[in-house]
């Protein structure tokens, strides 16, 4: 018995070969002897039943001259898994067709962190093995159900599942979209008074995107977090529902999600969490955003540089006179110099020598007041 493997929804070709390599009379039947189709000597394909009943069955007329009389079954269904009989030259050839199906749990669009379950449906009596390869090259194998917990952004793309049965294989390709922001976290460094822009690009594109979102903000100086803005998303158009009066936020009406603050102030420094709930999805997308604000000031004989917001302990804060060595450099959030000499002073926030934020302040001779450029 010849074995042919097929994929639901696609086509399968069941072979039937003549020893004489020329056109001859043949008939394809179901195992219960019902006729499917055949050729009875006039080179015309005769179907066994009503057109609607047999419209998925066909043969390759072009192959008949070469003594090949395949049965083509289109739009395969799971119930097509059975034995088919080809009758030609006073002999019967049995061909077993097994149709398989691999599906993703409920949806192919999954939120980051959710689980993906791939299920293999196979005909009774079959004992296939299945192995799936993720877009990032990770292999998972198992029985009829394969699970991947904690989906990551790199899991977005085409998953390839190979079903193996009796040394024959059939390959399935499933497109999985992991719904997430491009970055889990971002940090913005600004001098006091500068404009601030926050961007929240999504890592996926869909034709219609609908949902709602909110940005909660925990200012470093505040005891509790506060909702800064709530918005709706309808077919990729953003509409603001409610916005705090301080700060005066503006939000762009089209993707990627984008917010602007007119100016960076110490009282705004802190961490935000933007959540986006998508229609017909359980769970939410999250992106953390951090704002670090720097201020350089001179009061009487004290030149001070301060930063507010979530800074890493390894960041260095320095005060230096332009083109000179740093006068003071500490892993702290405030540094100062007493009786600074006149000139242009620089306050620098740096990470392993890379300057993240810089603020200049001009110190005038002691009889005048400082100038902040």
């Amino acid at each position: 018995k010849t074995l042919v493997l097929g994929k639901e929804g696609e086509s399968a070709e069941l072979p039937c070969e003549s020893s004489q390599k020329k056109i001859t009379v043949f008939t394809w039947k179901f195992s219960d002897q019902r006729k499917i189709l055949g050729q009875h000597g006039k080179g015309v394909l005769i179907r066994g039943g009503s057109p609607s009943q047999f419209d998925r069955f066909d043969s390759k007329k072009g192959a008949w001259e070469k003594g090949s009389f395949p049965l083509i079954i289109n739009k395969l269904k799971m119930e097509d898994s059975q034995t088919y009989i080809c009758e030609l030259e006073n002999r019967k050839e049995e061909v077993e067709l097994w149709v398989f199906k691999v599906t993703a749990n409920s949806d192919t669009h999954l939120l980051q962190g959710q689980s993906l379950t791939l299920t293999l449906e196979s005909p009774p009596g079959s004992s296939p093995s299945v192995q799936c390869r993720s877009p990032r090259g990770k292999n998972i194998q198992g029985g009829k159900t394969l699970s991947v917990s904690q989906l990551e952004l790199q899991d977005s793309g085409t998953w390839t599942c190979t079903v193996l049965q009796n040394q024959k294989k059939v390959e399935f390709k499933i497109d999985i979209v992991v719904l997430a922001f491009q970055k889990a976290s971002s940090i913005v460094y600004k001098k006091e008074g500068e404009q601030v822009e926050f961007s929240f690009p999504l890592a996926f594109t869909v034709e219609k995107l609908t949902g709602s979102g909110e940005l909660w903000w925990q200012a470093e100086r505040a005891s509790s977090s506060k909702s800064w803005i709530t918005f709706d998303l309808k077919n990729k158009e953003v509409s603001v529902k409610r916005v705090t009066q301080d700060p005066k936020l503006q939000m762009g009406k089209k993707l990627p999600l984008h917010l602007t603050l007119p100016q960076a102030l110490p009282q705004y420094a802190g961490s935000g969490n933007l959540t986006l709930a998508l229609e017909a999805k359980t769970g939410k997308l999250h992106q953390e955003v951090n704002l670090v604000v720097m201020r350089a000031t001179q009061l009487q004989k004290n030149l001070t540089c301060e930063v507010w917001g979530p800074t890493s302990p390894k960041l260095m804060l320095s005060l230096k006179l332009e083109n000179k060595e740093a006068k003071v450099s500490k892993r702290e959030k405030a540094v100062w110099v007493l009786n600074p000499e006149a000139g242009m002073w620089q306050c620098l926030l740096s990470d392993s020598g890379q300057v993240l934020l810089e603020s200049n302040i001009k110190v005038l001779p002691t009889w005048s007041t400082p100038v902040q450029p």
């Epitope: 404009q195 601030v196 822009e197 709706d232 309808k234 077919n235 990729k236 158009e237 509409s239 603001v240 503006q250 939000m251 762009g252 009406k253 089209k254 984008h258 602007t260 007119p262």
Partner: antibody
């Protein structure tokens, strides 16, 4: 070719009402956001009101909020601007404009209809 | 609402001149800005969208650029048909706002 044609302008007394229409041809109306923009005699352009393609979200300039209402009828491919409590400063040429698919600019404009508010 | 400050309000130039018009936004607006040309008695026409994209059918002498919240429209070599009024429009968020306009006149 996409065309927009405004109508409904005219002379009205202060405190009166008027309804402007903008008939669109050559496009699937519900796909695009639409806006009304006006221009007072000898002055610059002023955005007045906007509506999302779905018709669910409407937006207004502060100068007309509470007095003007923007609506659309997708079956008639028509945009409307209901103007109530009209003032002399509402005197202008009113244009309707269609936005691009991604709300990125006003790519098609009508020729405008004139509204005069005077006693 | 976001304010758009356009300058200059009027400008005299000759055919062949290079001209620049600027708009400054009171808030960050990404690239969500368009430049429109209007001739007397006519509806405005889009020249540039998304700060620097040239609208189909618009001559390449028109170009747009952005630096932070400052936006510039440049006409590299003025042609007689370019004498008109130019407006910037922020479509970052509602309510949309136009600049005050720049009237470009023949010197």
């Amino acid at each position: 070719e996409v065309e927009l044609l405004e109508s409904g302008g005219g002379l009205v007394q202060p405190g009166g009402s008027l309804r402007l229409s903008c008939a669109a041809s050559g496009l699937t109306f519900s796909t695009f956001a639409m806006s009304w923009v006006r221009q007072a005699p000898g002055k610059g352009l002023e955005w007045v009101s906007g509506i999302s393609g779905s018709g669910e979200n409407t937006y207004y300039a502060d100068s007309v909020k509470g007095r003007f209402t923007i609506t659309s009828d997708n079956s008639k491919n028509t945009l409307y601007l209901q103007m109530n409590s009209l003032r002399a400063e509402d005197t202008a040429v009113y244009y309707c404009a269609k936005e691009g698919y991604n709300w990125n600019y006003m790519d098609v404009w009508g020729k405008g209809t004139t509204v005069t508010v005077s006693s | 609402a976001i304010q758009m400050t356009q300058s200059p309000s009027s400008l005299s130039a000759s055919v062949g001149d290079r001209v620049t018009i600027t708009c400054r936004a009171s808030h960050g607006i990404r690239n969500d800005l368009g430049w429109y040309q209007q001739k007397p008695g006519k509806a405005p026409k889009v020249l540039i969208y998304e700060a620097s994209s040239l609208q189909s059918g618009v001559p390449s002498r028109f170009s747009g650029s952005r630096s932070g919240t400052d936006f510039t429209l440049t006409i590299s070599s003025l042609q007689p048909e370019d004498f008109a009024t130019y407006y910037c429009l922020q479509d970052y968020t509602y309510p949309y706002t136009f600049g005050q306009g720049t009237k470009l006149e023949i010197k």
